[in-house]
Interface confidence: medium
């Protein structure tokens, strides 16, 4: 057959798998006269041979790791041994098989990491090599953490980049590592070839000792800085320090202020760069950041708090250029005229903003000076000497000095003398009848207009009308707004109406003046009006506070543990009864009054997590309307499943008699969760009596090899007990049995005489 395995002499390339015993020729070169024989030179390594007739072959298995390419030359010779053709290059490419295990460069690594280091930032690399071809899975390495010691509450503090071997902290490690509690950790790291994806991969392990060092990258105590400082700026106020020299510090203003008065130097010292003004901003919160030379953050930012301390740098201010009060002609001595409320921008409730009031001038001084007095601290003006007469002096002007401990301000008050309030407001009708509203009427709706009139001096406190609801609305669901020009009252809904608590409300209004009535005049029935508010029911279902309630517990919580709770409210205010729907596993009960959910049976993550049930909230009484929400219970794994065999191993056999010790491979598994790594089982023989005949050796975390120790076995079935421990917390052990039959074989299968065919083993070793 010309072409594939034979042909003329020309440059050629062949690919051959390493490790394979020769099974066929490589090529048959055909000679063209005068050539009669062939000669092979180059990197033959005494493996490649060419027969005189041109048959190129190899005589033993190749090893890619010794030589990955053999560069050969083939020449054609004539009868006298003279080269008449060639030599031509023949290239043998050796294809890789997985015949080398990965090995770590060190059997032990040591490293250190600071507490609170950034998750995912490598602090140590482990490195393994594999002589196989890295361009194929045979040389592609996969790193894994096998175990972390101590392992606190099943939480992994460390993680490894499967491809690079970079070890870093997990989020939990960053938060929880504390040298005061645990100054050192040990990791066992495995490396597998085949990218970790094959059960035939080779592996190696190494040990990593990690020291946890203290983190001095901590937020400083809050700083107090006096405002308007006259000291030379910048002023150092606090400091931060990265754990190692060479960090680049910066400040981040999260509030994006137009003026950010802080800076940091490359020692980590923080300065205020200009005087602060408490009245502009009384506190600052910003962040200090440490970065490496490439500008990458070394850790999380630190929060810096600066409180600005008040000094008395603000004078009192008047509420308005002129404050206007009214006083009736006949008012008695001591009556309150009104209160002047000045302001001070300095810090509240301190001496810097504590104000004193004093009248410094009254004009006109008719009929005398000192007609008014002001309460020193409260600012309340009172009539001091006698009643006033509008026809003599209709208006007084007061100049009032308002002072804090350092500053004085003058405020101006105008006091208008008005007619006596001897007329009461009179409602246009005493009964506004019935009004029927649904309980879901919008807040802010105007539901009624009321009107009263007052014959006193217009646009004074004697004729102004204020409407109050004095009866029938203890919940404050209604309010009345007054139009100051017309004295019309608009009754509005301030809070939701509620059929359940107030189906009928008998409302009574009172119309009053802000000014007191003269002595002897009293409000009478004319100043009162009533109306009846009838609220109709709008029944609504209870409302859950969430669409989905979620809780997380370990699968082994004690029965009776509160695992969560739900809340719903009924718009009508009816009581609610809670129940569960869809609790198919009978794991939960709900307190029908409080909504608390308890476990009533053992939980099992392996049966399915999260466990989803529906919670129902039903009105008690009424129309029994109900609403449904979801409750999801996430079950955290505990090590509660012992290891077992991964498949059925009946039918294992060895041909009897054994010519040499034999072995078989088996796989274990368990049903628990293995988040950070695969299982890490250890294997041993189930009883001491088996040790003379058998031995178990671990291949990796899930596979082991059972080997015979000798060849002297009887022709029968042996049941080999294997103890498999999962090394979990708590550790669980399973004892499994591997039935192995030693039998006479015919063509590699167990032979049984007729009548003895039951249970023939099918797997030969």
């Amino acid at each position: 057959q010309e072409g594939k395995f034979s042909g003329p002499l020309k440059p050629m390339t062949f690919s051959i798998y390493e490790g394979q015993e020769p099974s066929q020729i490589i090529f048959q070169f055909k000679a063209n006269p005068p050539a009669v024989t062939f000669e092979l030179t180059g990197e033959t390594d005494n493996i490649f041979v060419i027969e005189r007739e041109g048959l190129l072959y190899y005589n033993r298995a190749l090893d890619r790791e010794t030589r990955s390419t053999h560069n050969l030359q083939v020449a054609a010779l004539d009868a006298n041994g003279i080269i008449v053709e060639g030599p031509v290059p023949i290239t043998i490419k050796v294809k890789d098989i997985n015949d080398n295990r990965p090995t770590f460069l060190q059997s032990k690594y040591e490293g250190s990491v600071r507490q609170n280091s950034r998750p995912g930032k490598p602090f140590l690399y482990v490195n393994a090599t594999d002589l196989d071809d890295p361009a194929t899975p045979n040389g592609q390495l996969y790193y894994q953490i096998v175990i972390q010691l101590p392992m606190i509450n099943n939480v992994m503090y460390f993680q490894i980049n499967n491809k690079t071997g970079a070890i870093s902290l997990t989020r939990e490690g960053s938060q929880e590592l504390n040298p005061a509690k645990n100054p050192s950790y040990n990791l066992v790291i495995s490396v597998k070839d085949m990218g970790g994806q094959s059960e035939n991969s080779f592996s190696d392990t190494t040990s990593v000792d990690i020291i946890v060092t203290e983190n001095i990258w901590k937020a400083p105590k809050p700083v107090e800085m006096v405002e308007n400082s006259t000291d030379p700026h910048p002023i150092k106020i606090t400091q931060v320090r990265w754990n190692d020299p060479g960090a680049q510090y910066s400040l981040v203003d999260k509030e994006k202020l137009p003026r950010f008065p802080f800076s940091i130097d490359q020692e980590g010292d923080i300065y205020v760069t200009q005087p602060l003004d408490r009245e502009e901003k009384d506190a600052y919160v910003f962040y200090a950041v440490a970065k490496d030379e490439y500008g990458k953050p070394l850790s999380y930012p630190l929060e810096i708090h600066v409180k600005v301390k008040d000094i008395n740098d603000n004078p009192p201010t008047c509420p308005s250029p002129v404050t206007v009060f009214e006083v009736q002609e006949n008012e008695r001595l001591g009556n309150s005229i009104g209160t002047l409320t000045a302001h001070d921008r300095d810090e509240e409730n301190t001496a810097n903003s504590f104000l004193n009031y004093r009248i410094v001038e009254q004009t006109p001084k008719l009929p005398m000076d000192g007609l008014f007095l002001i309460q020193t601290y409260a600012g309340m003006l009172q009539l001091a000497k006698q009643s006033l007469k509008k026809q003599d002096t209709p208006q007084y002007n007061l100049t009032i000095e308002v002072s804090d401990k350092d500053f004085k301000t003058l405020c101006f008050v105008q006091i208008n003398v008005i007619d006596i309030n001897d007329q009461i407001p009179i409602f246009e009708k005493s009964d506004y009848g019935n009004l029927t509203l649904a309980e879901d009427t919008n807040i802010g709706s105007t539901i009624l207009t009321i009107q009263a009139t007052d014959a006193d001096e217009p646009f004074t406190g004697s004729s102004k009308i204020l409407y109050h609801i004095i009866k029938g609305d203890s919940e404050g669901r209604l309010g009345v707004d007054t139009d100051p020009h017309t004295n019309t009252g608009y009754v509005i809904i301030k809070k939701p109406l509620d059929f359940e608590t107030a189906a009928v409300s008998n409302i009574v209004f009172k119309a009053e003046n802000p000014e007191p009535l003269v002595f002897g005049v009293k409000y009478n029935a004319s100043s009162f009006a009533k109306f009846t508010l009838i609220v109709t029911d709008v029944n609504e279902a209870p409302q859950f506070s969430q669409h989905v309630f979620q809780a997380k517990v370990s699968e082994d919580v004690a029965i009776g543990t509160k695992v969560g709770n739900v809340t719903a409210k009924d718009p009508e205010g009816l009581d609610i009864s809670y129940s569960l729907r869809g609790d198919t596993r009978g794991w939960l009960k709900i307190d029908h009054v409080t909504g608390e959910i308890f476990s009533v049976a053992p939980l099992d993550r392996e049966a399915g997590s999260p466990y989803r049930v529906q919670v129902v909230a039903t009105e008690v009484g009424g129309s029994s309307l109900s609403s449904v929400s979801e409750f999801h219970l996430i079950l955290m794994d505990v090590n509660d499943n012992p290891p077992r065999l991964a498949k059925d191993y009946t039918g294992l056999f060895f041909c009897h008699p054994l010519s040499a010790p034999g072995s078989l491979i088996f796989e274990a598994t368990d049903d628990d969760q293995h988040l950070f790594r695969g299982p890490h089982f250890t294997f041993s023989l189930g009883s001491g009596s088996l040790q003379n005949d058998w031995e178990v050796s671990k291949i990796n975390g899930t596979h082991a090899r059972l080997s015979t120790r000798h060849t002297e076995f009887e022709e029968r079935e042996y049941v080999v007990l294997i103890r498999i421990n999962d090394g979990g917390r708590p550790p669980l052990e399973g004892i499994v049995s591997l039935p192995v039959t030693f039998c006479s074989c015919v063509e590699g299968s167990c032979f049984r005489p007729a009548g003895h065919q039951t249970g023939i083993p099918t797997v030969g070793m």
Partner: antibody, heavy 122, light 107 residues
């Protein structure tokens, strides 16, 4: 060092009240449930009350339900037992014991205090 | 409530003896069971958790086994410091309950 120290025991008349405290140190207190266990003189151990890590769930033995209240202050790393309407049969050494982390119950009751003595006598 | 019983209530043994204490629960408690040792005037000390796991720092002569309703604590070779009272505790179901105790005395 992980440590629990009880205090607040003493002599009290029947019907009286007492408040026990337990100060925790050396571990992250707010990660763990806690319990009170008592032991009457010459008798065995009796679980009295338990509380989950954040104080949201409390549990009591029937013998004390309605009279005793368990609480905790995570900011102060402290556990408390308010005992009202005390009876002679409440006389015991009261131990504070660390429960399990969050709700991981297999690992409960690994750390115990030395106990504080409560004597109810007229 | 789950009742816990222990047997024997007391036993006398010599140094080097193998000692077994049994604890029974009135209903299944999975493996939520611990064994505690208490010496006079001292607080209880946990020996075994999760029915069969040895507390770190506890000598390996102590072992636990069982699941469900029947559990045993075994001391493979009694030492002088092991003379004490031993309690089992179930924390499978509220209220948690202790066994009445087994006193191990010197013969």
């Amino acid at each position: 060092e992980v440590q629990l120290v009880e205090s607040g025991g003493g002599v009290v008349r029947p019907g009286g009240s007492l408040r026990l405290s337990c100060a925790a140190s050396g571990f992250t207190f707010d990660n763990y449930g806690m319990s009170w266990v008592r032991q009457a003189p010459g008798k065995g151990l009796e679980w009295v009350s338990g509380i989950n890590w954040n104080g949201g769930s409390t549990y009591y033995a029937d013998s004390v339900r309605g009279r005793f209240t368990i609480s905790r202050d995570n900011a102060k790393n402290s556990l408390y037992l308010q005992m009202n309407s005390l009876r002679a049969e409440d006389t015991a050494l009261y131990y504070c014991a660390r429960g399990s982390r969050y709700n991981w119950s297999y690992d409960a009751f690994d750390i115990w205090g030395q106990g504080t003595l409560v004597t109810v006598s007229s | 409530d789950i009742q816990m019983t222990q047997s024997p209530s007391s036993l006398s043994a010599s140094v080097g003896d193998r000692v077994t204490i049994t604890c029974r629960a009135s209903q299944g408690v999975r493996n939520a069971l611990g064994w505690y040792q208490q010496k006079p005037g001292k607080a209880p000390k946990r020996l075994i958790y999760a029915a069969s796991s040895l507390q770190s720092g506890v000598p390996s002569r102590f072992s636990g086994s069982g699941s469900g309703t029947e559990f045993t604590l075994t001391i493979s070779s009694l030492q002088p410091e092991d003379f004490a009272t031993y309690y089992c505790l179930q924390h499978n179901s509220y209220p948690f309950t202790f066994g009445p105790g087994t006193k191990v005395e010197i013969k």
